[in-house]
Amino acid sequence: MADGSSDAAREPRPAPAPIRRRSSNYRAYATEPHAKKKSKISASRKLQLKTLLLQIAKQELEREAEERRGEKGRALSTRCQPLELAGLGFAELQDLCRQLHARVDKVDEERYDIEAKVTKNITEIADLTQKIFDLRGKFKRPTLRRVRISADAMMQALLGARAKESLDLRAHLKQVKKEDTEKENREVGDWRKNIDALSGMEGRKKKFES
């Protein structure tokens, strides 16, 4: 934090003389890539964050898998009793095998019936969905755009409400002070509108068309 206080103590630099540019330069200025904004987070820190996020995601997946295993175990323990063989001989074990096979056959029959019902339902749902589309007319899906997601948002998505309490990542980051960007006096005119127009998808399209 010492750096911060020394910055505040320094005298502000005098602004450089305004540079006049010819209007022919404006198009090039708008279309050429701008000087990259200096990232707040260093590359190594970004990598560290990514690794941390992946670790958390991996832990979550492992926990979910463990929960599923436990759930399966609980479900099986209610459906399948432990074998009680004490005092049972060859005759009973033979009969028990027959009983268990009969039970398996019954369960298989039930499973087959359920599968048949499910297949029937799926077919019906598909038919109804098709009818809905036919009634609506052609349905056009909106094109999906790629969205940049911040580390905070990613943590929020991964951990939900726990994100805040588990790790406030930003608190651990070294604050990098923004350097004062040189402010230029630019002519007031249509060029600003041109830049706005050209910076979006329309602008790129026009650039490729020209």
Epitope: P82, E84, A86, G87, L88, G89, F90, E92, Q99
Partner: antibody, heavy 121, light 107 residues
Amino acid sequence: EVQMVESGGGLLKPGGSLKLSCAASGFTYSNYAMSWVRQTPEKRLEWVATISSGGSYSFYPDSVKGRFTISRDNAKNTLYLQMLSLRSEDTAMYYCARRDNYFGSSFMDYWGQGSSVTVSS
Amino acid sequence: DIQMTQTSSSLSASLGDRVTISCRASQEITNYLNWYQQKPDGTIKLLIYYTSRLHSGVSSRFSGSGSGTDYSLTISNLEQEDIATYFCQQGHTIPLTFDTGTKLELK
């Protein structure tokens, strides 16, 4: 000392129902399978039912299947035989017996004194 | 069902005699055979299990043998307390079945 005491027998009409009980003592009841065996008036022994140590599995001859139900309460060390739709041929002395096995050979190693059931119109 | 049959329903012997009771199964029961004794008062006791194994507390005067479908119980040196009915039982297949029993009497 291993002991089994049957109770609940009696005289009843065909089609009637009855529940026999067998109180076991002198051994860890929940570790053993148990059986009911009956002896007809002609002195023939007939196996009636067997239940596994935890009560999950039961075995019956065709003659009683669907009419008789063997059950147990390990907390009370008690074995039961629920008898429904009783017939005259079910008239017998009903014995409760402990099961054990040796290399796949199962046997009734201890028997109770029996409880008499008479089905007559 | 496996049928169990004894050669005789009753047998007369004198005290001190060696007595053999036979039992036959309608099919192979691979030594899964047990012998029981029923006293005149109705009490039933296990004598022999798995063809030849002597149950705890049973006198060594009792012995069992056999294989396949043919089995036998032998009482050496018959005593008064041995006067009872003897049953064989197969443990090979459900339903478990007993024979009709052999009543041992004194001559």
